[in-house]
Interface confidence: low
């Protein structure tokens, strides 16, 4: 008898008008439920109205949800990206600030006459870190030559050295090695450490990028209505006390968050290789040491050469000629006291290890973050029941909810009872992340072993050459393919192919 | 092949405001820094504006600094820029260029052009 | 600033050379690309692009080198088409942004 089924629909007043929605379309009484769309068609208390009102909210509702998970690990992936960061820029400014404040002194004129020099070589070094299109070899490579030209012509100011004689000392300096090892030394080191550090902080980066980019992928029409029927139907149905079941909860959003879910492995990947990178922090080539005590090798480069200077100007002139005597310059240079050299290795200020350990702790946290997401919405945002399986909302009724809980996944959702997905229709922004997540997971493999990843030219023809030596097996198992760097978030800049060992320069 | 097409040229007013618009095909449009070049009657080409590949990073020529402003949507594969307060020496042939890679900053954009529009006539009088 | 110089003539087949220059004594490790504009009004082509790299529809008569802070476009066996104004690009460290320098007009 309609009569006796005819409750009153106080409750799912309350809990629509809580919702800012308009009590006049709220029935007084059950009616009859034929025009309901997404909940079953018993009586209820909803109107067709009503019912498309908190769908739309339901949906808006774990969109919210959604983007407050995403934005928490955006955060804190954002935090420690901008601690690496000034860490980083620190040491290099630490350093270029003890030049500045050491070298006059230490080297008068050979120093201040070329003090631009070294600030642009600081510059570039920024650059270089930040993401530039340098190639730090070249980029050394061109300062010690100017170097070598301006002190050359400033140790002999009684000769006259014209363009072409320059140009053959130029030539020549390969050979004469006329800063020692410093430069060597200098160019391994900065490419192993400005790889590693830029690498992992843009690691960060394209972590954070993804994040945001999934967060941002709307949820389709199926989502929505599973959703609704979890949340809301109940209330509609004369039974709003009964939360959904726990094992309901997960279906439905395991098939919402499917494409999402698709990110594990690769997003796993990311953090293993970024976790791996920071062993590459510590030593006499880490990035402390290095990226601090840039100064203590141009030091050492200039007292090489005022070392060899004699020796040096023989074997020019044996190679290039007897250069003309300048008869205004003045006699040659006296020969300079030596600048004092700061202790190579730096001691560790103990930041470093502090930003590593935590970084580590907290990627590790975050490593099942995708697959875990069903799971943790569901029990953070969902208001699941606590009470026995027979009295929780199944989608249906209150009772017991009788399908078994879907895999992780797309390809997993194809039997899944609560929302239809296509698994054959991945989502494109996903795939592309996966994509952005495989190419920086890449990159920090190859900076493990020290190189800068050899990108594509702009033909886009796929082409490009393999890393150098020296592979961990448990990096080269799961290498992968790296010619695909033309699709790439704002993070993943294309660098210059640089190879760091000695010889071997791929550009 | 790529193909950039450039419109919203014409005669304009001193003291108003350019919209141009660069419609890009035929390469991944998002993973590219592009920019706009200009060229006066009779001159040479000046640098107008770059921007990096997500947007996130811009130069502009000093003639048109704190009167323009570029902008790209990648979705749509379009660059855009905007020129207040025209002067008659705004008039000439804006290109939009695409850069054949960048890093955020796009401090070299003028030397790694690869690809030029046909370019948009723009007369202020 | 980039200075080029204003004019360069040749030959065909002869070998051309057309430098570009930038200002300050040093320049860091800058890009330099080289542009060609065959009349005023037409859009320019690039022929060289980060120092020496060359478009795959361009010829390889056409080449690139920098020593310093000075760029070279190469044209070796110039060719009555090579006729045309040549601008190159960089960085202008100043304004923090893109310059070209004022044009070579090349004459065969």
């Known amino acids: 008898d309609p009569a006796s089924k005819s409750r009153s629909c106080g409750e799912v007043r309350q809990i629509y008008g809580a919702k800012g929605f308009s009590l006049s379309d709220v029935p007084q009484a059950e009616i009859s439920g034929e025009h309901l769309r997404i909940c079953p068609q018993g009586y209820t208390c909803c109107t067709s109205e009503m019912e498309e009102n908190l769908a739309n909210r339901s949906h808006a509702e774990l969109e919210t949800a959604l983007r407050d998970s995403s934005r928490v690990l955006q955060a804190m992936l954002a935090t420690q990206l901008r601690s690496f960061d000034d860490h980083f820029q620190h040491l290099l400014n630490d350093s270029e600030r003890t030049l500045q404040a050491t070298f006059p002194g230490a080297f008068g004129e050979l120093y201040t006459q070329n003090a631009r020099a070294f600030r642009d070589l600081y510059s570039e070094l920024r650059l270089y870190y930040r993401g530039a299109n340098l190639h730090l070899e070249e980029t050394l490579a061109e300062f010690w030559a100017r170097l070598l030209e301006r002190l050359f012509k400033q140790l002999h100011p009684q000769l006259l050295l014209p363009d072409d004689y320059l140009d053959c000392l130029g030539k020549q300096a390969e050979a004469l090695r006329p800063f020692g090892e410093a430069p060597r030394e200098l160019r391994l080191r900065a490419t192993r450490a400005f790889v590693a550090a830029r690498s992992f902080v843009q690691g960060l980066g394209v972590a954070s990028d993804v994040v945001r980019k999934v967060a941002q992928v709307p949820l389709g029409p199926e989502c929505s209505r599973a959703v609704m029927k979890l949340v809301y139907c109940a209330h509609c149905l004369g039974v709003p006390g009964a939360r959904p079941c726990p094992d309901y909860c997960r279906n439905v959003l395991k098939g919402c968050l499917a494409n999402q879910a698709d990110l594990d492995a690769e997003w796993r990947n990311l953090l293993d290789s970024m976790v791996l990178i920071t062993d590459k922090f510590w030593g006499t080539s880490g990035v402390e040491s290095v990226i601090g005590s840039v100064h203590t090798w141009l030091a050492e480069a200039i007292n090489a050469l005022q070392d060899n200077r004699d020796t040096l100007t023989a074997k020019v002139i044996q190679g290039c000629g007897n250069p003309k005597v300048n008869p205004q310059g003045p006699g040659p240079e006296e020969k300079r006291r030596r600048g004092k050299l700061a202790p190579r290795e730096r001691p560790p200020s103990g930041t470093l290890e502090k930003l590593v350990s935590e970084a580590k702790a907290q990627l590790r946290d975050v490593q099942d973050f995708w697959i875990s997401l069903p799971g943790t919405l569901c029990s953070e945002k969902m208001a699941l029941s606590t009470a026995s399986d027979d009295r929780c909302w199944n989608g249906m009724a209150r009772g017991r909810y009788l399908p078994e809980v879907m895999g992780d996944g797309l390809a997993n959702q194809i039997n899944n009872p609560e929302v239809e997905v296509d698994i054959t229709k991945p989502d494109m922004t996903i795939r592309q992340q996966i994509m952005q997540l495989k190419i920086m997971t890449n990159r920090l493999r190859s900076a493990y072993n020290g190189n800068d990843v050899d990108f594509q030219d702009a033909s886009d023809d796929g082409s490009g050459s393999g890393s150098g030596d020296g592979c961990l097996d448990d990096l080269c198992s799961r290498k992968v393919s790296r010619k695909s760097s033309s699709s790439r978030t704002p993070l993943t800049h294309a660098l210059p192919g640089l190879s760091e060992q000695e010889g071997q320069k791929t550009s | 092949a790529v193909t950039l097409d450039e419109s919203g040229g014409g005669l304009q007013t001193p003291g108003g405001a350019l919209s141009l618009v660069c419609k890009a095909s035929?390469?991944?449009?998002?993973?590219?820094?592009m920019g706009w070049v200009r060229q006066a009657p009779g001159k040479g080409l000046e640098f107008v504006a770059s921007?990096?590949?997500?947007?996130?990073?811009?130069a502009y020529g000093s003639a048109v600094k704190g009167r323009a402003t570029i902008s790209r949507d990648n979705r749509q594969s379009t660059l855009r820029l905007q020129l207040n307060n025209l002067r008659a020496e705004d008039t000439g042939t804006y290109y939009c260029?695409?850069?054949?890679?960048?890093?955020?900053?796009?401090?070299?954009?003028?030397?790694?052009?690869?690809?030029w529009g046909h370019g948009t006539e723009v007369t202020v009088s | 600033a980039l200075t080029q110089p204003a004019s360069v003539s040749a030959n065909p087949g002869e070998t051309v050379k057309i430098t570009c220059s930038g200002s300050?004594?040093?320049?860091?490790?800058?890009?330099y690309g080289w542009y060609q504009q065959k009349s005023p009004g037409s859009a320019p082509v690039t022929v060289i692009?980060?120092?020496?790299k060359r478009p795959s529809d361009i010829p390889s008569r056409f080449s690139g080198s920098t020593s310093g802070s000075t760029a070279t476009l190469t044209i070796t066996g110039v060719q009555a088409e090579d006729e045309a104004v040549y601008f190159c690009?960089?960085?202008?460290?100043?304004?923090?942004?893109?310059?070209f320098g004022a044009g070579t007009t090349l004459t065969v």
């Open positions: 921007i990096s590949s997500d947007g996130s990073d811009t």
């Open positions: 300050g004594s040093y320049t860091g490790s800058y890009y």
């Open positions: 260029a695409k850069s054949y890679r960048c890093s955020w900053n796009c401090w070299d954009y003028a030397a790694k052009i690869d690809a």
């Open positions: 690009g960089s960085y202008d460290r100043s304004s923090d942004s893109g310059i």
């Open positions: 692009y980060n120092n020496n």
């Open positions: 035929g390469f991944t449009y998002s993973s590219y820094a």
